[in-house]
């Protein structure tokens, strides 16, 4: 039961995380105009990975895509790449994990195959989450650097009479969405990896244990439980299941309803 819960929860958390990574990647508010300690402008600027936007006090919003590829900063290209890799890995991970879920049956798939798939998807989610966190962090670092650079020479102009106020940018909502989403995907991946350990079938499955009485040779076949003699390497009491039988874990499904906002 715990294994299914962990696997199901890991899947749901990762699903929310990947949806968040996709949302963050598409969002326009990666950087927003810094309004603190600045003259109040009737124009609000914000930028995303794919386009920059301007919202006027009139209510009119104009967005312009970055139609150049070569003219863009290398850091922005790197962030785009990290986010896309994160989305692709996450999407593949989701696909793999759907088939790995214990509550879903596909033919006569072995537990070992499900365990491997769960581990694979878990690793994919971890890498996906790390890619998103790295991408957002690189962009945040770029913003911080530019912020202090523009603060250093905030007022530029001729003779001090005519001034041009340089627009400074600060963290946009997308960064926080990206960090949280990346973290959720990472947590979901870890949960999948933990679930994988519980899914892996036992290496030894003793069907019978012999007890040797003095002078007599009597064999006992306890139905399903291995008697512990205290000798040898098999000192733990373990529940043993016949090959074809299903555990409670395998029968129980884990229905949940999550709405991504």
């Amino acid at each position: 039961m715990a294994v299914t819960a962990c696997q199901g929860l890991g899947f749901v958390v990762s699903l929310i995380g990947i949806a968040g990574i996709i949302a963050a990647t598409c969002m326009d508010q990666w950087s927003t105009q810094d309004l603190y300690n600045n003259p109040v402008t009737a124009v609000f600027n914000y930028q995303g990975l794919w386009r920059s936007c301007v919202r006027e006090s009139s209510g009119f919003t104009e967005c312009r895509g970055y139609f150049t590829l070569l003219g863009l900063p290398a850091m922005l290209q790197a962030v785009r790449a990290l986010m896309i890799v994160g989305i692709v890995l996450g999407a593949i991970g989701l696909l793999v994990s759907i088939f790995a879920l214990k509550c879903i049956r596909i033919g006569s798939m072995e537990d070992s195959a499900k365990a491997n798939m769960t581990l694979t998807s878990g690793i994919m989610f971890i890498v996906s989450g790390l890619c998103a966190i790295a991408g957002v962090s690189v962009f945040a670092n770029m913003l911080v650097t530019n912020f202090w650079m523009s603060t250093a020479n905030m007022y530029t102009g001729m003779g001090g009479m005519v001034q041009t106020v340089q627009t400074r940018y600060t963290f946009g909502a997308a960064l926080f969405v990206g960090w949280v989403a990346g973290g959720l995907t990472l947590i979901g991946g870890v949960m999948m990896c933990i679930a994988c350990r519980g899914l892996a079938p036992e290496e030894t499955n003793y069907k019978a244990v012999s007890y040797h009485a003095s002078g007599h040779s009597v064999a006992y076949k306890p139905g399903g439980f291995k008697a512990s003699t205290g000798f040898g390497s098999n000192t733990k009491n373990k529940k043993i299941y016949d090959g074809g039988a299903r555990t409670e874990d395998e029968v129980q499904s884990y229905p949940s309803k999550h709405d991504y906002v």
Partner: antibody, heavy 118, light 113 residues
Framework: DVKLVESGEDLVKPGGSLKLSCAAS????????MSWVRQTPEKRLEWVAY????????YYADTVKGRFIISRDNARNTLYLQMNSLRSEDTAMYYC???????????WGQGTTLTVSS | DIVMTQSPSSLTVTAGEKVTLSCKSS????????????LTWYQQRPGQPPKLLIY???TRESGVPDRFTGSGSGTDFTLIISSVQAEDLAVYYC?????????FGGGTKLEIK
């Protein structure tokens, strides 16, 4: 046809209060930000206040901040300007105007005259 | 506050003449985000409210005759009337639409001989 009609002119004593209203028609009022602008007897134009389409963003000129309150009723297609602690320098022709692209003011009312005098 | 300075304060011209009105702002009105200048020109005929002529420094409002042309960037702006007509008798105002509080220039009074 876009129409903005301000309430009638008035004579108010210094320190007094008055509420101006501007009835809008011919366009979807709730989609547009609105502004009040005044013109002094010397014919100088002074921007007074701004309110966003939903009424959530409001800005005032420093000269009226703390004394004037801009508001809107989108259900009634009406813009308001509550003026308190009126001074003689508030004497002007008050126009309500619709905010357009580039934050320009594309439609103006005919204006209402406010005279603050003892 | 942004100071808008218009020159000349008044101008007398003959019909058909080309007129150049100037407007200077104390700070740049150019927004880096969209490379647009937030400056507007208005025309106010006697006894009427102001009428929008040009926004974004150079975009002509629909219905405005093409003899009116706005230009300039940053802090220096110009309104050109290529061939003045009798109906152009008015006061022309420029406005800063970029910084709050929005501020108007003192106006240029155009008179026809």
């Amino acid at each position: 046809d876009v129409k903005l009609v301000e309430s009638g002119e008035d004579l108010v004593k210094p320190g007094g209060s008055l509420k101006l209203s501007c009835a809008a028609s011919g366009f979807t009022f709730s989609n547009y930000a609105m502004s009040w602008v005044r013109q002094t007897p010397e014919k100088r134009l002074e921007w007074v206040a701004y309110v966003s389409s939903g009424g959530d963003y409001i800005y005032y000129a420093d000269t009226v901040k703390g004394r004037f309150i801009i508001s809107r009723d989108n259900a009634r297609n009406t813009l308001y300007l509550q003026m308190n602690s009126l001074r003689s320098e508030d004497t002007a022709m008050y126009y309500c105007a619709r905010v357009y692209f580039g934050n320009s003011l594309d439609y103006w009312g005919q204006g209402t005259t406010l005279t603050v005098s003892s | 506050d942004i100071v808008m300075t218009q020159s000349p304060s008044s101008l007398t011209v003959t019909a058909g003449e080309k007129v150049t009105l100037s407007c200077k702002s104390s700070q740049s009105l150019l927004n880096g985000g969209n490379q647009k200048n937030y400056l507007t020109w208005y025309q106010q005929r006697p006894g009427q409210p102001p009428k929008l002529l040009i926004y974004w420094a150079s975009t002509r409002e629909s219905g405005v005759p093409d003899r009116f042309t706005g230009s300039g960037s940053g802090t220096d702006f110009t309104l050109i009337i290529s061939s003045v007509q009798a109906e152009d008798l008015a006061v022309y105002y420029c406005q800063n639409d970029y910084y709050y509080p929005w501020t108007f220039g003192g106006g240029t009074k155009l008179e026809i001989k």
